[in-house]
Interface confidence: low
Amino acid sequence: LYFSRDAYWEKLYVDQPAGTPLLYVHALRDAPEEVPSFRLGQHLYGTYRTRLHENNWICIQEDTGLLYLNRSLDRSSWEKLSGRNRGFPLLTVYLKVFLSPTSLREGECQWPGCARVYFSFFNTSFPACTSLKPRELCFPETRPSFRIRENRPPGTFHQFRLLPVQFLCPNISVAYRLLEGEGLPFRCAPDSLEVSTRWALDREQREKYELVAVCTVHAGAREEVVMVPFPVTVYDEDDSAPTFPAGVDTASAVVEFKRKEDTVVATLRVFDADVVPASGELVRRYTSTLLPGDTWTQQTFRVEHWPNETSVQANGSFVRATVHDYRLVLNRNLSISENRTMQLAVLVNDSDFQGPGAGVLLLHFNVSVLPVSLHLPSSYSLSVSRRARRFAQIGKVCVENCQAFSGINVQYELHSSGANCSTLGVVTSAEDTSGILFVNDTKALRRPKCAELHYMVVATNHQTSRQAQAQLLVTVEGLYVAEEAGCPLSCAVSKRRPECEECGGLGSPTGRCEWRQGDGKGITRNFSTCSPSTKTCPDGHCDVVETQDINICPQDCLRGSIVGGHEPGEPRGIKAGYGTCNCFPEEEKCFCEPEDIQDPLCDELCREQKLISEEDLGGEQKLISEEDLHHHHHH
């Protein structure tokens, strides 16, 4: 047995006479032989579920579910109840109604075996019948909604009449009907005004019925019509077996470059027209078992169950269903030497499914694990500026397909052929298994005899000791120019373009910092800032070279505080900033502030200045100071 609603509403008035019928509660059967028996909880509850008092006023007919006033609720009783309501005005009280047989102890009130009956309390006597509006004569203030279990015997689940109105205003005639599409499984009996199902419902055919209840009021010569929604939801049971969409029960996969633990190797989808078990229970009751194979297979793979609700069309309406993705996942990193082919089977069991037929499916995965060879190009050639600063990134080395690798460990090393010209270093990028080449020794860069640097690049997978080698030729270009005095170690300190571009900083490949002009769109990823190289900093990611020294790119790497409009990076740096962002790495602080100069005249002036510097001065920069700008403004 179950209630057709989890909550009911009615109005209560002071001194309403004993014997007044209030409302019916309805139970529907799970099996044809069941007979409902109703009982009320012992207590009345108030605001925020305060237990107010033993219920001495309202009774229920155990067989019919009719609630009625056993004795009038007088003003003093009401004041007594109000005093227990935690200081809140007592506007609503509720009772619990249980379906027997249930435990006799009154505790949780949960559908389907318990419903709450709410009474809106009016600290006045019942109003004159003539003063009641048609809406008040027809329907409760709160619109009901109904829940009916699929595949259960049909039965009565609602009674339209407002019983106190019928009892106290017998001269007002109220008629009801349901507006329903052809062939809907509901009927409203014209005499008793009971609404019932005609036959058992099937949720997989239709889950929601949005009916409309029509009430016609006759009071003397007056006739008025009131319409309200009358929604019915069909509740699911596990009556559908799992199936394969389009009959696909086998997936084939190749494991090659993606060998990392937790990599999804292949996915098979199972469809179930049901949406039960509910999400909390689903994984426990919808089981998947990787059938025993050899030890290696059991250790290497696992199956993950990812259920998702979906919608499918049935008879012109959409109903919910479930798709279950079963993912074959690597349980550990695979060595690059691993080379084998296998067939795996997964048993899926919808343990709640009662039949007919079986709730069991067998999923098949055919997996080939291929070995990976390490190859480098025969040689690399690149150039570096003699002005480059320490930690400047000048290039990358990468074994064949390294961008596609995951779970494959490759370490890069540089072996220099000239002992005193070991200028470069290499670090392995965790993201794409490439090696980032960077300037490690700027003194060596400046030696005339180090104009050409020869290295051997060695890539090693330590797990298997497999290696690959390549020649690297680095040409050192340009003249060394000493930096201006007073330049900061970090490009990020500079807050304005002129001071940014006249200094270098750690990580700068050209020996000069670069200005990145932002888009000026509020808090943006593209904020204005000074960087050693806009190719790598800031890019929202603190790379393996930048982690060597916080002065290289605090915009990506700082873990300290950021002042001003910004969105912090995860787990560090500035993801987005307002205006211009500059940083003081030693103090572990960054500041994001509005651009200093934003009026059109200034923009025009900056354009003029740029033209002067590039054309008239043949590239020799004449920088205009802030004082010059202010002077231009005032004159």
């Epitope: 509850y45 925020y48 579920r49 305060t50 237990r51 227990r84 935690r86 200081g87 505790g107 949780e108 009130c109 949960q110 909390g280």
Partner: antibody, heavy 118, light 107 residues
Framework: EVQLVESGGGLVQPGGSLRLSCAAS????????MSWVRQAPGKGLEWVSG????????FYVDSMKGRFTISRDNSKNTLYLQMNSLRVEDTAVYFC???????????WGQGTLVTVSS | DIQLTQSPSFLSASVGDRVTITCWAS??????LAWYQQKPGKAPKVLIY???TLQSGVPSRISGSGSGTEFTLTISSLQPEDFAAYYC?????????FGQGTKLEIK
């Protein structure tokens, strides 16, 4: 099986902010009032804030009104506590708890530690 | 706000002893009181609610009584697993408040 799992705790400086989350499962989340209760190291339990099932009514202990905000996302079955202007004395383990019909807390999370220190 | 005062703050007892913890409310809270047990590093666990109703799964040697402003928690025969901290909590109105706690130790 009812489960409440808190997250979002950590170390924060005085004046800073944190947002705690509590993921609920195994019961009809919308039906129940939920609360946050905290416990300073070596001290007793202190109720912090409560929220009704729909999220329309919220309740706070006076000393935290204005600084702390309780909220819930019933579509995600998640309870939140936004804590601003944190003080050293807010250092505690913060538990989320499900209120029973009678008002007592019948299920608790495992707690998340919030440390406010300079 | 409603204040709750627990007594005693510390209690030493032996296995098999009968112990009583008292909780006083600063105003009438009817039967709106709960008792919790807490072990180190764990979340509290409800023992009694509505002053005297035993939470399901809690052993019957634990009982609660009282109404209005004075409440007691009684453990009729202490077991090793009962040594823990105990708190009362009023549920009569927001803000909910807890007693300062009673630490029950092995003598």
């Amino acid at each position: 099986e009812v489960q409440l799992v808190e997250s979002g705790g950590g170390l924060v400086q005085p004046g800073g902010s944190l947002r705690l989350s509590c993921a609920a499962s195994g019961f009809t989340f919308t039906t129940y009032f939920m609360s946050w209760v905290r416990q300073a190291p070596g001290k007793g339990l202190e109720w912090v804030s409560g929220i009704s099932g729909s999220g329309t009514s919220t309740f706070y202990v006076d000393s935290m009104k204005g600084r702390f905000t309780i909220s819930r996302d019933n579509s995600k079955n998640t309870l939140y506590l936004q804590m601003n202007s944190l003080r050293v004395e807010d250092t505690a383990v913060y538990f989320c708890a499900k209120e029973n019909t009678y008002g007592h807390f019948d299920f608790w999370g495992q707690g998340t530690l919030v440390t406010v220190s300079s | 706000d409603i204040q709750l005062t627990q007594s005693p703050s510390f209690l030493s007892a032996s296995v098999g002893d009968r112990v009583t913890i008292t909780c006083w409310a600063s105003q009438d809270i009817s039967s709106h009181l709960a008792w919790y047990q807490q072990k180190p590093g764990k979340a509290p666990k409800v023992l009694i609610y509505d002053a005297s109703t035993l939470q399901s799964g809690v052993p019957s040697r634990i009982s609660g009584s009282g109404s209005g402003t004075e409440f007691t928690l009684t453990i009729s025969s202490l077991q090793p697993e009962d040594f823990a901290a105990y708190y009362c909590q009023q549920l009569d109105g927001y803000p909910y408040t807890f007693g300062q706690g009673t630490k029950l130790e092995i003598k």
